[in-house]
Interface confidence: low
Amino acid sequence: AESCTSRPHITVVEGEPFYLKHCSCSLAHEIETTTKSWYKSSGSQEHVELNPRSSSRIALHDCVLEFWPVELNDTGSYFFQMKNYTQKWKLNVIRRNKHSCFTERQVTSKIVEVKKFFQITCENSYYQTLVNSTSLYKNCKKLLLENNKNPTIKKNAEFEDQGYYSCVHFLHHNGKLFNITKTFNITIVEDRSNIVPVLLGPKLNHVAVELGKNVRLNCSALLNEEDVIYWMFGEENGSDPNIHEEKEMRIMTPEGKWHASKVLRIENIGESNLNVLYNCTVASTGGTDTKSFILVRKADMADIPGHVFTR
């Protein structure tokens, strides 16, 4: 079943079929006898009840308010009311671009890496039974694809695939022909899976500390998925029970790179932790990058130039 219209603010293009489906649909079936009403308010008009006689373009079916098609003057607020349930939507109908096969404000942007899997499938589940045929256009030129019911592109992306892809569904309703357009702006970007990993921040960091206190040394890097980030300290790692490597945190950027962060926690700082190197290293197939931290007693920090301190 088609999901309900949960978004409170909706923008649609004039001249296309459109529907609003309230989100207590299953409940409405259980209480058929309950009065269910749809209202519209816009500008000076306050809460005008809608029914099929309101306009030849409006149809009401169970949980759905349909527009055949939606027009500029349908802009406004819509309400569904049933017993003690109310749902509200704000509908903004925008002008169709008469000079293009799509309207720029109704474009979904997607970024695809070159050589990665790229797919466009033309589907419209709500109007599926009414759709006669569907065409897929690239930059407003029709693509000749085998399946004219649900045209699909499935391939490994190439730079030439960049462009605007428009799925246009043609359907009949009450003897009239309508179309619904969904456009994707596909940007193909360089395969960025192998950047040169870099540790962020200064290469040498003096950290002012107090004996007996705790400190957290944060090491951050921009790296590839398969790269590793690790801490090295002392003669053999793990010999000091007061030193703990925290779990590595990674977040992915939209371009498929990774920001990694790994914290070294030193508890109950002692003399043995001072003036020794705590090294953080990022390693990849292309080499390594290392940055160092040195713990310095707060009282001694006057001896060190200010610019070497971490913020």
């Epitope: 942007s109 940007t187 360089e190 962020l200 939209p254």
Partner: antibody, heavy 118, light 112 residues
Framework: QVQLVQSGAEVKKPGASVKVSCKAS????????MHWVRQAPGQGLEWMGW????????NYAQKFQGRVTMTRDTSISTAYMELSRLRSDDTAVYYC???????????WGQGTLVTVSS | DIVMTQSPDSLAVSLGERATINCKSS????????????LAWYQQKPGQPPKLLIY???TRESGVPDRFSGSGSGTDFTLTISSLQAEDVAVYYC????????FGQGTKVEIK
């Protein structure tokens, strides 16, 4: 310290090409993307494209595709931007800018003024 | 492309007073996977290249005075100079780096 030093001002005739250079120092040249941004006199900033100095891969703004070519010479840590079929509205200051990884631009060159005039 | 619109185009503020510049993007530049807004602010003085002030919408670049601050999320962003100094006279640009890179048209800040 990080420095991006660009080539000097150029005067070109319409239809000609111009090649601007950007020499990087103070960091690992192949570790950061290099972008080119231009600014027409009294106008705002316009992104033109980037080059990955490590692989030589490029990505150009749609507006400049077919007219712009970005290259690099890793042996001298220099990025180049060549713009062909120049028009008078290409008169602008052209900047190179370093990018830590498809993000914001943390260092900029001083700019190169390209004047296109018949 | 994502269109960035700044307001006002120019702003005259007395020394020591607050200056506020707004920037609106035509679509959200917030990326839910890492909770970041892909927006930066730059300062450009006459005859100089732009200088990075703020990135991730609110993170101040190292060395930038703390009178500069950035705020906002999604499509609406603000750069605030809490107490305008003579050296802050410049043109300020917002830039999105979510899908390619686009800049606002710039806001000129002058002393009243």
């Amino acid at each position: 310290q990080v420095q991006l030093v660009q080539s000097g001002a150029e005067v070109k005739k319409p239809g000609a090409s111009v090649k601007v250079s950007c020499k990087a120092s103070g960091y690992t040249f192949t570790g950061y993307y290099m972008h080119w941004v231009r600014q027409a006199p009294g106008q705002g900033l316009e992104w033109m494209g980037w080059i990955n100095p490590n692989s030589g891969g490029t990505n150009y703004a749609q507006k400049f595709q077919g007219r712009v070519t970005m290259t690099r010479d890793t042996s001298i840590s220099t990025a180049y931007m060549e713009l062909s079929r120049l028009r008078s509205d290409d008169t602008a200051v052209y900047y190179c800018a370093r990018d830590m990884g498809d993000l914001f631009f943390d260092y900029w060159g001083q700019g190169t003024l390209v004047t296109v005039s018949s | 492309d994502i269109v960035m619109t700044q307001s006002p185009d120019s702003l005259a503020v007395s020394l020591g007073e607050r200056a506020t510049i707004n920037c609106k993007s035509s679509q959200s530049v917030f990326y839910s996977s890492n909770n970041k807004n892909y927006l930066a602010w730059y300062q450009q003085k006459p005859g100089q290249p732009p200088k990075l002030l703020i990135y991730w919408a609110s993170t101040r670049e190292s060395g930038v005075p703390d009178r500069f601050s950035g705020s906002g999320s999604g499509t609406d962003f603000t750069l605030t100079i809490s107490s305008l100094q003579a050296e802050d006279v410049a043109v300020y640009y917002c830039q999105q780096y979510f899908i390619t890179w686009t800049f606002g048209q710039g806001t000129k800040v002058e002393i009243k």
